[in-house]
């Protein structure tokens, strides 16, 4: 009464599973099974995952930890979070780069490479959406520039230049004769 009851020892439950002869308590995350328990409902002998390995969940049968993944330098990946005993390395892209999935149905575990983000400023355009999970989305031309073909062209600095209609609308000039 007042104390916390330990989970009932039931081989079909979540806390204990039959390992070898007996129902044993599993190993916590970050630990692997060295030896099963030596009595009914006992604790297994669990050891901490060695460096560069991990186990993310409580487990009953893992006798070795999973090797931490190495981020793919060829694909310009970097480690966003280092591997720990309970979690794998989280690979991603450095600031200014975005994830380009290598498969069409992209999920978190899909292979990917990092692409440099578009620099809207260098293209003389507004940045509409900052680059993170996908490439930068550039908007309209910056002030002092007008749309010409696929790019932004600088407004003429003198009245001598030729200024088409779009130029005139943006730059405030009329074509001079």
């Amino acid at each position: 009464q007042g104390g916390t009851r330990s989970p009932r020892c039931d081989c079909a439950g979540d806390f204990h599973k039959k390992i070898g002869l007996f129902c044993c308590r599993g190993c916590p995350a970050g630990h692997y099974l060295k030896a099963p328990c030596t009595e009914p409902c006992g604790n297994s002998t669990c050891l901490v995952c060695p460096q560069d390995t991990f186990l993310a969940w409580e487990n009953h049968h893992n006798s070795e930890c999973a090797r931490c993944q190495a981020c793919d330098e060829q694909a310009s990946q970097v480690a966003l979070e280092n591997c720990s005993a309970v979690a794998d390395t989280r690979c991603g892209c450095k600031p200014g780069w975005f994830v380009e999935c290598q498969v069409s149905q992209c999920v978190s575990s899909s292979p990917f490479y990092c692409q440099p983000c578009l620099d809207c400023g260098a293209l003389h355009r507004h940045t509409r959406l900052l680059c993170s999970r996908r490439d930068t989305d550039c908007g309209t031309c910056l002030p002092g520039f007008y749309e010409h073909g696929d790019g932004c062209v600088s407004c003429p600095t003198s009245t001598l230049g030729s200024c088409p209609e779009r130029c005139a609308a943006v730059c405030g000039w009329r074509q001079m004769f």
Epitope: G20, L21, E39
Partner: antibody, heavy 123, light 111 residues
Framework: QVQLQQSGGGLVQPGGSLRLSCAAS????????MSWVRQAPGKGLEWVAT????????YFPDSVKDRFTISRDNARNSLYLQMNSLRAEDTAVYYC????????????????WGRGTLVTVSS | DIQMTQSPSSLSASVGDRVTITCRAS??????????MQWYQQKPGKAPKLLIY???NVESGVPSRFSGSGSGTDFTFTISSLQPEDIATYYC?????????FGQGTKLEIK
């Protein structure tokens, strides 16, 4: 009827190796844990090894750990005890036994035994 | 490890006598309301034979003159009326936890 036929005993020098076998019949071998128990001349019984059914985990007392290995071949209905780095104190009659589980209490008792095989470690 | 202490180490009795052997464990062998204790009979030159399991349950085919009782750490094995064929050494053994351990044995002789 349940039968456990043992073989492999004999004379071996200290530091040597020996492999004991136990051929089972008359029951579904793969469904039972199995054990080895030994008895030194004129002495009592000493548990030596157990192997579980299914996942084949093995268990040993400290006296033989890292020297003995227990294994099973369910296809051949056979149990084995590989004994390495043998010492004079390992001299004994070795018995294989079936471990029967009773009820839902994870409780085992050795309900059938082989006739035993003598292992003598001497130079 | 759980130590099993059997007494007496040997005893002599007459045919028809009631014979009692005791076994004490160094810690409780109870689990979930069951005593994980058994008794074996070993005749000279033969393999051991299971007589009693779970402290008081008589194994199938074993004569009813053999019985067992007790719980926790203290256990008793009884032969209600000793027969000539009962000449053997008797062992208690616990299965509560590994390593499994046996008592040192009680050698029973006929007077």
């Amino acid at each position: 009827q349940v039968q456990l036929q043992q073989s492999g005993g004999g004379l071996v020098q200290p530091g040597g190796s020996l492999r004991l076998s136990c051929a089972a019949s008359g029951f579904t071998f793969s469904s039972y844990a199995m054990s080895w128990v030994r008895q030194a001349p004129g002495k009592g019984l000493e548990w030596v090894a157990t192997i579980s059914d299914g996942d084949s985990y093995s268990y040993f007392p400290d006296s033989v750990k890292d020297r003995f290995t227990i294994s099973r071949d369910n296809a051949r209905n056979s149990l084995y005890l590989q004994m390495n780095s043998l010492r004079a104190e390992d001299t004994a009659v070795y018995y294989c036994a079936r471990d029967r589980i009773y009820g839902s209490v994870q409780y085992y008792a050795m309900d059938y035994w082989g006739r035993g095989t003598l292992v003598t470690v001497s130079s | 490890d759980i130590q099993m202490t059997q007494s007496p180490s040997s005893l002599s009795a007459s045919v028809g006598d009631r014979v009692t052997i005791t076994c004490r464990a160094s810690e409780s062998v109870e689990f979930s309301g069951t005593s994980l204790m058994q008794w074996y009979q070993q005749k000279p030159g033969k393999a051991p034979k299971l007589l009693i399991y779970a402290a008081s349950n008589v194994e199938s085919g074993v004569p009813s003159r053999f019985s067992g009782s007790g719980s926790g750490t203290d256990f008793t094995f009884t032969i209600s009326s000793l027969q000539p064929e009962d000449i053997a050494t008797y062992y208690c053994q616990q299965s509560r936890k590994l390593p499994y351990t046996f008592g040192q044995g009680t050698k029973l002789e006929i007077k």
